[in-house]
């Protein structure tokens, strides 16, 4: 059974992940972003179901494509290099989903834009956090 300290750690990691995803969304989904139109042409796979931490496997598998799209953005728009940012997210995702069980991600039929993709995972984090508090 999860202890209060492990629940608190999970909550903090989810909050960190949430802020990272929101920061990326803020950097992209902005009328001042010269590459927004181009970025919106890239398609991302969405999870068929995302209600548990193990479903973060679906996010992990899309981190490489996410990094590639972020590389399009002008460097002056990004405080952190995309590689560093995605690396930070990857570390948190691995810790949250755990590595002891292998989970095969199931994707929805419809693909999504980067904005829809980020919003979906932001909602996921908020939902899990709300169950922990």
């Amino acid at each position: 059974a999860p202890t209060s300290s492990s629940t608190k750690k999970t909550q903090l990691q989810l909050e960190h992940l949430l802020l990272d995803l929101q920061m990326i969304l803020n950097g992209i989904n902005n009328y001042k972003n010269p590459k927004l139109t181009r970025m919106l042409t890239f398609k991302f796979y969405m999870p068929k179901k995302a209600t548990e931490l193990k479903h973060l496997q679906c996010l992990e598998e899309e981190l490489k494509p996410l990094e590639e799209v972020l590389n399009l953005a002008q460097s002056k728009n990004f405080h952190l290099r995309p590689r560093d940012l995605i690396s930070n997210i990857n570390v948190i995702v691995l810790e949250l989903k755990g590595s002891e069980t292998t989970f095969m991600c199931e994707y929805a039929d419809e693909t999504a834009t980067i904005v829809e993709f980020l919003n979906r995972w932001i909602t996921f984090c908020q939902s899990i956090i709300s169950t922990l508090t």
Epitope: N26, G27, N29, K32, H79
Partner: antibody, heavy 120, light 111 residues
């Protein structure tokens, strides 16, 4: 001094069209992004559309996408909003506002507004 | 879209007394470069809006120093240290971190 003057408002029937203009003076118009913001009678502010300084990018609020078109003529220092398929809910005072994308302050100067009334 | 929620919606204040307006965003407004694009606008009766504060706490040119802004992340506050008669109107918070959205507005009136 910076001046923005809107015109083109009036009473129009639902489904009809209207074109608003915003004449700019007192600054280098071609260096600034421009927005349209509207305010329904007795209500709050709603962002409508933005156009880049060079006209290269245009974005709209969902409720006007496919009906409204923002454009600009930098040689005439004028911003436009072409409004088609007008609805009762488009009734509002329409303001143009300036935005220096590369500075820290957005929406730093506003026009006095022009009233659009959509009614049968 | 980012939703901006202001409280209170109406604020009756005595002349010379302080006033405070809160604004909360539905998600963090911190950008990837560390900046936070949260502004405050004033709209006097019958007038267009006017920029007061940008990037949380910076006063725009010509704005009296009795106006100040503070906050971080998702919670922001506009304070007027001593309300004057000319401060009557509606105050809006606005975020431009993503596509612009405004709070519902807070009406400042004199008691």
């Amino acid at each position: 001094q910076v001046q923005l003057v809107e015109s083109g408002g009036g009473v129009v029937q639902p489904g009809r069209s209207l074109r608003l203009s915003c004449a700019a003076s007192g600054f280098t118009f071609s260096s600034f992004g421009m927005h349209w913001v509207r305010q329904a009678p007795g209500k709050g502010l709603e962002w409508v559309a933005v156009i880049w300084f060079d006209g290269s990018n245009k974005y709209y609020v969902d409720s006007v996408k496919g009906r409204f078109t923002i454009s600009r003529d930098n040689s005439k220092n004028t911003l436009y909003l072409q409004m088609n398929s007008l609805r009762a809910e488009d009734t509002a005072v329409y303001y143009c506002a300036r935005d220096d994308f590369w500075s820290d302050y957005p929406f730093d100067y506003w026009g006095q507004g022009t009233l659009v009334t959509v009614s049968s | 879209d980012i939703v901006m929620t202001q409280t209170p919606l109406s604020s009756p204040v005595t002349l010379g007394q302080p006033a405070s307006i809160s604004c909360r965003s539905s998600q963090s407004l911190v950008n990837i470069d560390g900046s936070t694009h949260l502004s405050w606008l004033q709209q006097r009766p019958g007038q267009p809006p006017r920029l007061l504060i940008y990037k949380i706490s910076n006063r725009f040119s010509g704005v009296p120093d009795r106006f100040s802004g503070s906050g971080a992340g998702t919670d922001f506050t506009l304070k007027i240290s001593r309300v004057e008669a000319e401060d009557v109107g509606v105050y809006y918070c606005m975020q431009t971190t993503q596509f612009p959205t405004f709070g519902q507005g807070t009406r400042l009136e004199i008691k």
